[in-house]
């Protein structure tokens, strides 16, 4: 028993960010005369939160009217709580001293924990595109959450990924935390329409996790396959040679026809057709006047896709042969494509 006790009945209080925290405190006596003060933390570095005697504390209101006679309820409310407000709050009775007030009795303290929602996860992929069969890294970041416990999962098209590493910082006590995760994803030719999803679950989200997404269309490059074929034309001195450019992504593509190594025509893919998997097909044709050539003609379809080194496929056109007769295809020359 003591002549005056300061009672803080709540050992801990949990408040969501943005809400109001109520910190309860009562005294068992009003004697000796002196103010109640609230502090965050203990010791010489403690932070004054409220002083009954003087000062302006715009975020703090008293639960009861402290100017009312015989009031021994010194509970306070702190508005618009942020993670920075977390800590242990002490209700302290001072007694009048000469010249300064003297700390008389302190409550046992109330630990204020702030529940803060994580920010929306931001997923970012590699800076440069990669081709199928390559492994690429995606990062996911979310900040400002509290408490520290959090769960992060990765998905690709709804299938959970297992190859990832996650860190929550800082390791020690903090007002709020950040999470950083890196996942490794193996690309396939069918990934143009794929999505990578980072999912964050936290106590503040009440079972409704936050998701961040990245479209693999931003990451993948599917190099084209080329096929050059010769088509007969009604006019006996003309041959139609087509170059089929198939299954490429993204659309950015430039095709050049060469006749015996000399540039005949250059064009940019425009009226492409889209495949179900999101890749594109395009066809270019070249009408060759056979009568203009004495010797055999080597026709080459050269494709530069998305700024990568050109790939090409050639076709030998026999001038002596009947126009309706098809020549032989050379093997594709694949100079520097990053196929996987």
């Amino acid at each position: 028993e003591e002549e005056l006790q300061v009672i803080q009945p709540d050992k801990s209080v949990l408040v969501a960010a943005g809400e109001t925290a109520t910190l309860r405190c009562t005294a068992t006596s009003l004697i000796p005369v002196g103010p109640i003060q609230w502090f965050r933390g203990a010791g010489p570095g403690r932070e004054l939160i409220y002083n009954q005697k003087e000062g302006h504390f715009p975020r703090v209101t008293t639960v009861s009217d402290l100017t009312k006679r015989n009031n021994m309820d010194f509970s306070i409310r702190i508005g618009n709580i942020t993670p920075a407000d977390a800590g242990t709050y002490y209700c302290v009775k001072f007694r009048k001293g000469s010249p300064d007030d003297v700390e008389f009795k302190s409550g046992a303290g109330t630990e204020l924990s702030v529940r803060a929602k994580p920010s929306a996860p931001v997923v970012s992929g590699p800076a440069a595109r990669a081709t199928p069969q390559h492994t690429v890294s995606f990062t996911c970041e979310s900040h400002g959450f509290s408490p520290r416990d959090i769960t992060l999962k990765w998905f690709k098209n709804g299938n959970e990924l297992s190859d990832f590493q996650t860190n929550v910082d800082p390791v020690g006590e903090s007002v709020s935390y950040s999470i950083h995760s890196t996942a490794k994803v193996v690309l396939t030719r069918e990934d143009v329409h794929s999505q990578v999803i980072c999912e964050v679950a936290h106590v503040t989200l009440q079972g409704d996790p936050l998701r961040g997404t990245a479209n693999l269309s931003e990451t993948i490059r599917v190099p084209p396959t080329l096929e050059v074929t010769q088509q007969p034309v009604r006019a006996e001195n003309q041959v139609n040679v087509t170059c089929q450019v198939r299954k490429f992504y993204p659309q950015r593509l430039q095709l050049t026809w060469l006749e015996n190594g000399n540039v005949s025509r250059t064009e940019t893919a425009s009226t492409v057709t889209e495949n179900k998997d999101g890749t594109y097909n395009w066809m270019s044709w070249l009408l060759v006047n056979v009568s203009a050539h004495r010797d055999d003609v080597k026709l080459t379809c050269q494709v530069e896709h998305d700024g990568q080194p050109a790939v090409s496929k050639s076709h030998d056109l026999k001038v002596s042969a009947h126009p309706k007769e098809q020549g032989s295809n050379t093997a594709a020359e694949n100079t520097g494509s990053n196929e996987r």
Partner: antibody, heavy 114, light 111 residues
């Protein structure tokens, strides 16, 4: 049951130091302060000072230069020392519990005389 | 120092009547919404007995015939109705400022 009992010499010579003891029971001296109050014969009450539960003290400025209040918590005793006494210090000396002075001892009479 | 002036210095009251004692402080004894003024009863050869604390609160065991009122500098102790064993000296006391001080006392006699 809360009790306070003053004790000490009933007679003190002028210029000497008056020493009194207040022995308490029923409460802890770490949790409660103890006051000393005196009452000269046929006169009113005068507050001398208080020793708080934490051992800090506050004194009546009129007596501050001559008074010391201390305590021995383990023995449940509070001590009053008043130096350089004169006949004006003749009084009944009381100890009383806490800032509220809710319990008083019966008092002990001290006469200052040669 | 805060000087407490009690009046009257003495009064005689018949049993069943009302006795009113006033205490005037030289400066306010109010702080933090409360008046740090208290009242004591002292009978001959006995220590003072607390009656009222914080101007108007009855100490436990004290009959409801005793009541206190006032704030700031002016305070009143009322005994109604007075009984024979209420004959005593009555003191007001403040502990709002050091040094804590007592009034000079009011002697209540029963007619």
């Amino acid at each position: 049951q809360v009790q306070l009992q003053e004790s000490g010499p009933g007679l003190v010579k002028p210029s000497q130091t008056l020493s009194l003891t207040c022995t308490v029971s029923g409460f802890s001296l770490t949790g409660y302060g103890v006051n000393w109050i005196r009452q000269p014969p046929g006169k009113g009450l005068e507050w001398i000072g208080i020793i708080w539960g934490d051992g800090s003290t506050d004194y009546n400025s009129a007596l501050k230069s001559r008074v010391t209040i201390s305590k021995d918590t383990s023995k449940n005793q509070v001590f009053l020392k008043l130096s350089s006494v004169t006949a004006a210090d003749t009084a009944v000396y009381y100890c009383a519990r806490a800032g509220k002075m809710d319990y008083w001892g019966q008092g002990t009479t001290v006469t200052v005389s040669s | 120092d805060i000087v407490l002036t009690q009046s009257p210095a003495s009064l005689a009251v018949s049993p069943g009547q009302r006795a009113t004692i006033t205490c005037r402080a030289s400066e306010s004894v109010d702080s933090y919404g409360n008046s740090f003024m208290h009242w004591y009863q002292q009978k001959p050869g006995q220590p003072p007995k607390p009656l009222i604390y914080l101007a108007s609160n009855l100490e436990s065991g004290v009959p409801a015939r005793f009541s206190g009122s006032g704030s700031g500098t002016d305070f009143t102790l009322t005994i109604n109705p007075v009984e024979a064993n209420d004959a005593a000296n009555y003191y007001c006391q403040q502990n709002n400022e050091y040094p804590w001080t007592f009034g000079g006392g009011t002697k209540v006699e029963i007619k």
